[in-house]
């Protein structure tokens, strides 16, 4: 592509499923135009969680993402959400430079497009293309699980990657089951880990200009079944104004496959509790942990009726855990008024 050519996803329609997560490599100075949905009904574009304005050098307008001239700070994750919902129509990452990385090992490589200018680029030392995917350094996984470490990088010339374990070259030859090194995905995969896999894993990314490295620390736990663990303090007591949107968050850790429900406590015939002593609840959301955003409860355009106690309930084959929080809804016209939630802030319980 010449630098004057545009980066464009065609057609300008809601994408097919295989388009939903992509990486696009864009040359500096190149214009970008990406489409999402049909014209007026097009989705809203967000960069790193912030909605793009309809005007400016980088803009989201009538379903289009338009960048006049691609700059290094334009690199990052862009989402297109359907209007009036949280449905993701496009999920893509724009990368500066001419080296492709993968956002998902299981993707069809054909879904990647190299959109960079193929003319001579200045040499560049390796750099991490997705540091947000490398935020977690300390890992502890139950024996038998699969572990995947990734160090997505780029540079010019395209860097090579090699792996060390405890400072020594690591090819997995002494490991039962071996390892999978997917250089095009910058990843190391170990299936069915055992205690002897504990150690410090280092990815070393090098080219003629320089090198970078990153350490992952891996612990392998002997399996000890437990009910789900919920992060303390979540969900958190929240105060909102009528008409606003609220997100309640619940973080769940479970070895065994957990099942999560969001409940709202309700009153029936003037009572909050049934004859069995259990509270009356309404199930708002239910799914397993693999479902998208099950750990978040979205309440849109809240009204006074939405005020009350909400519970995140997580269960697995061993038992149940739940934590609750209060939502206080303030009238629109007097945002200075505050209502005190009950004494107990976020409280939690465990049941076998």
């Amino acid at each position: 592509l010449e630098a004057s050519e545009e980066v464009e996803l065609e057609p300008c329609l809601a994408p097919s499923l295989e388009q939903q997560e992509q990486e696009l490599t864009v040359a500096l100075g190149q214009p970008v135009r990406l489409c999402c949905g049909r014209a007026e009904r097009g989705g809203h574009w967000y960069k790193e969680g912030s909605r793009l304005a309809p005007a400016g050098r980088v803009r989201g307008w009538r379903g289009r993402l338009e960048i006049a001239s691609f700059l290094p700070e334009d690199a990052g994750r862009y989402l297109c959400l359907a209007r009036g919902s949280m449905i993701v129509l496009q999920n893509l990452t724009l990368i500066t430079g001419d080296s492709l990385t993968s956002s998902n090992d299981d993707e069809d490589p054909k879904s990647h497009r190299d959109l960079s200018n193929r003319h001579s680029y200045p040499q560049q030392a390796p750099y991490w293309t997705h540091p947000q995917r490398m935020e977690k350094k300390l890992h502890a996984v139950p024996a038998g699980n699969t572990v995947k470490f990734r160090c997505p990088a780029a540079g010019n010339p395209t860097p090579t990657i090699r792996w060390l374990k405890d400072g020594q070259a690591f090819h997995g030859e002494n490991r039962i089951g071996g390892i999978r090194l997917r250089h095009q995905h910058w990843s190391l995969v170990m299936e069915s880990v055992v205690p002897s896999d504990r150690g410090t894993y280092t990815c070393l990314v090098e080219n003629a200009v320089g090198s970078i490295r990153y350490n992952y620390l891996l612990d392998v736990l002997e399996r000890s079944p437990h009910r789900p663990i919920l992060q303390a303090g979540l969900p958190a007591n929240t105060t909102a104004v009528v008409g606003s949107d609220v997100e309640l968050l619940c973080k769940v850790y479970s070895d065994a496959q957990p099942h999560i429900q969001w409940l709202k406590h309700i009153v029936i015939n003037g009572s909050s509790f049934g004859a069995d002593g259990f509270p009356y609840v309404q199930v708002l959301k239910t799914a397993d942990i693999n479902s998208s955003e099950v750990e978040v409860l979205y309440l849109r355009n809240v009204s006074a009726e939405d005020a009350g106690e909400y519970t995140c309930l997580a269960g697995n084959s061993i038992g149940l855990s739940y934590q609750s929080a209060w939502l206080t809804v303030l009238p629109e016209e007097d945002p200075t008024w505050t209502a005190a939630a009950p004494e107990a802030a976020s409280h939690h319980h465990h049941h076998h």
Epitope: A140, R198, I212, E222, K251
Partner: antibody, heavy 120, light 112 residues
């Protein structure tokens, strides 16, 4: 309440040994990476060591490698630091701390510290 | 001891904005999340902020952070007397020398 409580500090001669303990409560100790951080009088913080949840992986700062040993007893919810061949420069308040995945591996809970003085 | 570099002191009057810098290298801040700790006089350190402005419960949003390349900074807006403390940046380190490094520490003084 989530809490860490260190003990075992005191005065010891150069070349001597000391064993620090850290009792954890209010959380599932066996699920967390734990560490020791020290602070010499009037100085800044220095990371000393970290240990994995199972105890099978330990990492040390160069300044204590070969002299200090970090360990844990998950059945007793207790973290230890065995300090041998102590030197004057090991004089510090020693804090035990929990590293949390929820907080992107930061040390989110700290004990109140125990003072170790190495002097003849 | 391998450290991140911070200014030894910073000060401001109540209500002012104070910024603390933290300079590291590609092996620590350049590749890793930055953590910030606050140590009030005579007490143990406490986690103040981490990552992209994530705070433990109870930490006011007057505290904010930013990161660029191998440097980071902590900003305290609307400075209050209770903010007088030592502040430390920290990061995991991928060099062969250290695994977790703290900054040299910055003493924040609230004037008048």
């Amino acid at each position: 309440e989530v809490q860490l409580l260190e003990s075992g500090g005191g005065l010891v001669q150069p070349g001597g040994s000391l064993r620090l303990s850290c009792a954890a409560s209010g959380f599932t100790f066996s699920h967390y990476w734990m560490g020791w951080v020290r602070q010499a009088p009037g100085k800044g913080l220095e990371w000393v060591s970290v240990i994995s949840p199972s105890g099978g992986l330990t990492i040390y700062a160069d300044s204590v490698k070969g002299r200090f040993t970090i360990s844990r007893d998950n059945s007793k919810n207790t973290l230890y630091l065995q300090m041998n061949s102590l030197r004057a420069e090991d004089t510090a308040v020693y804090y035990c701390a929990r590293s949390s995945g929820w907080a992107l591996d930061a040390f989110d809970i700290w004990g109140q510290g125990t003072m170790v003085t190495v002097s003849s | 001891q391998y450290e991140l570099t911070q200014p030894p002191s910073a000060s401001g009057t109540p209500g002012q904005r104070v910024t603390i810098s933290c300079s590291g290298s590609s092996s620590n801040i350049g590749s890793n999340i930055v953590h910030w700790y606050q140590q009030l006089p005579g007490t143990a350190p406490k986690l103040l902020i981490y990552g992209n402005n994530q705070r433990p419960s109870g930490v006011p949003d007057r505290f904010s952070v930013s990161k660029s390349g191998s440097s980071a900074s902590l900003a305290i807006s609307g400075l209050q007397s209770e903010d007088e403390a030592d502040y430390y940046c920290a990061s995991w380190d991928d060099s062969l020398k250290a695994f977790y490094v703290f900054g040299t520490g910055t003493k924040v003084t609230v004037l008048g």
